[in-house]
């Protein structure tokens, strides 16, 4: 049995530069305890878009939707979208550790990708 | 329906050790968090220990780290808490606990009674 | 540790009223819009019933007279109208990414 799911239903997502794009992320439980953030791209160059915790992300939104009983919602919504936004997002679980937290899971990833604002 | 039923509960001595168990059915027992929850007439209720639902990561507060032990067999449908150098503070009611995220303790057992006293 | 502040200690209100219970949590215990705020009830010599989780939601089978409200820190626990069998004692859950995690010190209600 998997200790927890990371759940990121949408594989791609496209939007309108200049609008808002929901990104949707669910985990089946706290346990482990520890943070969630989102990421986008994978590996060492990797990009913080946002943890609840600290920085600050004044474009970023919590998107708390789901109300169902098995799941956990962690979305979060980007605002006033631009090309340069375009990419794989990540909602990544992390496990608190000592001294640092450890990331634990990862969910599959949403493609962002830009559409030019309608004329 | 969910059962959880606790046993183990009993009298003993200051520094003696208990082991509490508790036996689950009517749920998929290993997808669930379980937990421990104390109940004492002075200071309401207290959150004891949690274990994830496959068993490897477990938290305790601070009162009874070290001292108390929580594991679990999914194959057997149940939950154990092992509790060493028991002080007359451990004194309480000791409900089992499940949870299907963790965050909110979702069906409570019975109880099992544990009086450590002299 | 996040401390929780609950009030009343106790409470009488008559039959068909509005009852209302409030938590404080020492820090917020909000999550990405989740609010890890609980709401249980104790009836005497039973265990603790889970009524609202997650601050706001209905648990399964129990009465829409029941709802919870509130976010971050302060929270509330509403029964309206107060029936006989909500005679019990109420408390509150904070389960954060903080541990440990905490209840509130309970509220016993009466009927006036």
């Known amino acids: 049995e998997d200790e927890l799911q990371v759940i990121q239903p949408e594989k791609s997502v496209s939007v309108a530069a200049g609008e808002s794009a929901t990104l949707r992320c669910a985990m089946t439980s706290l346990i482990p305890v520890g943070p969630i953030m989102w990421f986008r791209g994978a590996g060492a160059g990797r990009e913080l878009i946002y943890n609840q915790k600290e920085g600050h992300f004044p474009r970023v939104t919590t998107v708390s939707e789901l109300t169902k009983r098995n799941n956990l919602d962690f979305s979060i919504s980007i605002s006033n979208i631009t090309p340069a936004d375009a990419g794989t997002y990540y909602c990544v679980k992390f496990r608190k550790g000592s001294p640092d937290d450890v990331e634990f899971k990862s969910g599959a990833g949403t493609e962002l990708s830009v559409r030019a604002k309608p004329s | 329906e969910v059962q959880l039923v606790e046993s183990g509960g009993g009298l003993v001595k200051p520094g003696g050790s208990l082991r509490l168990s508790c036996a689950a059915s009517?749920?998929?027992?290993?997808?669930?968090?379980m937990s421990w929850v104390r109940q004492t007439p002075g200071k309401g209720l207290e959150w004891v220990a949690t274990?994830?639902?496959?068993?490897?990561?477990?938290y305790y507060p601070n009162s009874v780290k070290g001292r108390f032990t929580l594991s679990r067999d999914n194959a057997k449908n149940s939950l154990y808490l092992q509790m060493n150098s028991l002080r007359a503070e451990d004194t309480a009611v000791y409900y089992c606990?499940?949870?299907?995220?963790?965050?909110?303790?979702?069906?409570w057992g019975q109880g099992t009674t544990v009086t450590v006293s002299s | 540790d996040i401390v929780i502040t609950q009030s009343p200690a106790s409470l009488a209100v008559s039959l068909g009223e509005r009852a209302t219970i409030s938590c404080r949590a020492s820090?917020?215990?909000?999550?990405?819009?989740?609010?890890?705020m609980h709401w249980y009830q104790q009836k005497p010599g039973q265990p603790p019933k889970l009524l609202i989780y997650r601050a706001s939601n209905l648990e399964s089978g129990v009465p829409d007279r029941f709802s919870g409200s509130g976010s971050r820190t302060d929270f509330t626990l509403t029964i309206n109208p107060l029936q006989a069998e909500d005679v019990a004692t109420y408390y509150c859950h904070q389960s954060s990414e903080q541990l440990p995690w905490t209840f509130g010190g309970g509220t016993k209600v009466e009927i006036k």
């Open positions: 606990v499940s949870s299907m995220t963790g965050s909110s303790f979702d069906y």
């Open positions: 274990i994830s639902s496959g068993g490897t990561y477990t």
């Open positions: 009517g749920f998929t027992f290993s997808s669930y968090v």
């Open positions: 820090e917020s215990v909000d999550s990405y819009g989740n609010s890890f």
